[in-house]
Amino acid sequence: MQGQDRHMIRMRQLIDIVDQLKNYVNDLVPEFLPAPEDVETNCEWSAFSCFQKAQLKSANTGNNERIINVSIKKLKRKPPSTNAGRRQKHRLTCPSCDSYEKKPPKEFLERFKSLLQKMIHQHLSSRTHGSEDS
């Protein structure tokens, strides 16, 4: 299987992980976290990094702590820097994580999913049009 295909699988897997965590929003610490939305073009990877850095945490209540902690840790899996597309070129002009609106876990996860969907769409489009961006 090609690296590009594996990359797509990993991105879709992240969406599934977000979906799983959405089942447990009541078991997450109700902390407000930077949640990028309407991310400008070429800042997607920067925003992705902000989502990964956010301190999403299990509230350690109930019996779902294990699956929550495993899922959060898998959400933070770092893609290789070569996959970051134009991330390096445009990083200086992208908003800092702190500048994004802070949202509770439910909205944080919804916005993360939205960004992942956008990135997958862009990735597919760039492949269709022969671009080297991934």
Epitope: R10, Q13, R66, I67, V70
Partner: antibody, heavy 126, light 106 residues
Framework: QVQLVESGGGVVQPGRSLRLSCAAS????????MHWVRQAPGKGLEWVAF????????YYADSVKGRFTISRDNSKNTLYLQMNSLRAEDTAVYYC???????????????????WGQGTTVTVSS | EIVLTQSPGTLSLSPGERATLSCRAS???????LAWYQQKPGQAPRLLIY???SRATGIPDRFSGSGSGTDFTLTISRLEPEDFAVYYC???????FGQGTKVEIK
């Protein structure tokens, strides 16, 4: 080929200790989380413990928490299960299993246990 | 913690017949987190299906998985003699197993 081989099982008295080992070969051991799963005679599968690929996190079933310790030595491609304060209900075949989700972004991506050892039998009896 | 309930406990069928095994979760499970295993007597389990519907490497296409939310199904389209075994579903991440369904020869 990809292989897991458990050892260290045996007959032990209640309250005593035992250490199981699982030797891995045929794959990059340090890129995979690892599990211990057990099966009591005539019963179903029971997950016991999991360790992250780099040993940074460990998780345990409630039935063994505080008594069992999972560890790994990536330089030796070996997984361990230290079992203390053993009870009769710990009698089972113990399997080590590889977690199918590699730490490598381009690696395996299976949310499941994709490689299993043949098992080692632990009998706790006085 | 999530509980996975498999049904039926035992399925008595003949070779060539279709087997339908059910796995019901006590709370919603993302499809990616649901796996199925096969275990034959005296052998270690084998991963059959991951992500609720994807066959693991080397698994024949007579095995298929489906479902979402709380209801998942493993289907064996035409039972071969080597398919008579115990089947377990599992939620990834909590690593909870169902109690198993035994598929035996009628």
């Amino acid at each position: 080929q990809v292989q897991l081989v458990e050892s260290g099982g045996g007959v032990v008295q209640p309250g005593r200790s035992l250490r199981l080992s699982c030797a891995a070969s045929g794959f990059t051991f340090s890129s995979y989380g690892m599990h211990w799963v057990r099966q009591a005679p005539g019963k179903g599968l029971e997950w016991v413990a999991f360790i992250w690929y780099d040993g940074s996190d460990k998780y345990y079933a409630d039935s063994v928490k505080g008594r069992f310790t999972i560890s790994r030595d990536n330089s030796k491609n070996t997984l361990y299960l230290q079992m203390n304060s053993l009870r009769a209900e710990d009698t089972a075949v113990y399997y080590c299993a590889r977690d199918g989700d590699s730490s490598d972004w381009y690696g395996d991506y299976y949310f499941g246990m994709d490689v299993w050892g043949q098992g080692t039998t632990v009998t706790v009896s006085s | 913690e999530i509980v996975l309930t498999q049904s039926p406990g035992t399925l008595s069928l003949s070779p060539g017949e279709r087997a339908t095994l059910s796995c019901r979760a006590s709370q919603s499970v993302s499809s990616s987190y649901l796996a199925w295993y096969q275990q034959k007597p005296g052998q270690a389990p084998r991963l059959l299906i991951y992500g609720a519907a994807s066959r693991a490497t080397g698994i024949p296409d007579r095995f298929s998985g489906s479902g979402s939310g709380t209801d998942f199904t493993l289907t064996i389209s035409r039972l071969e003699p080597e398919d008579f075994a115990v089947y377990y579903c599992q939620q990834y991440g909590s690593w909870t197993f169902g109690q198993g369904t035994k598929v035996e020869i009628k």
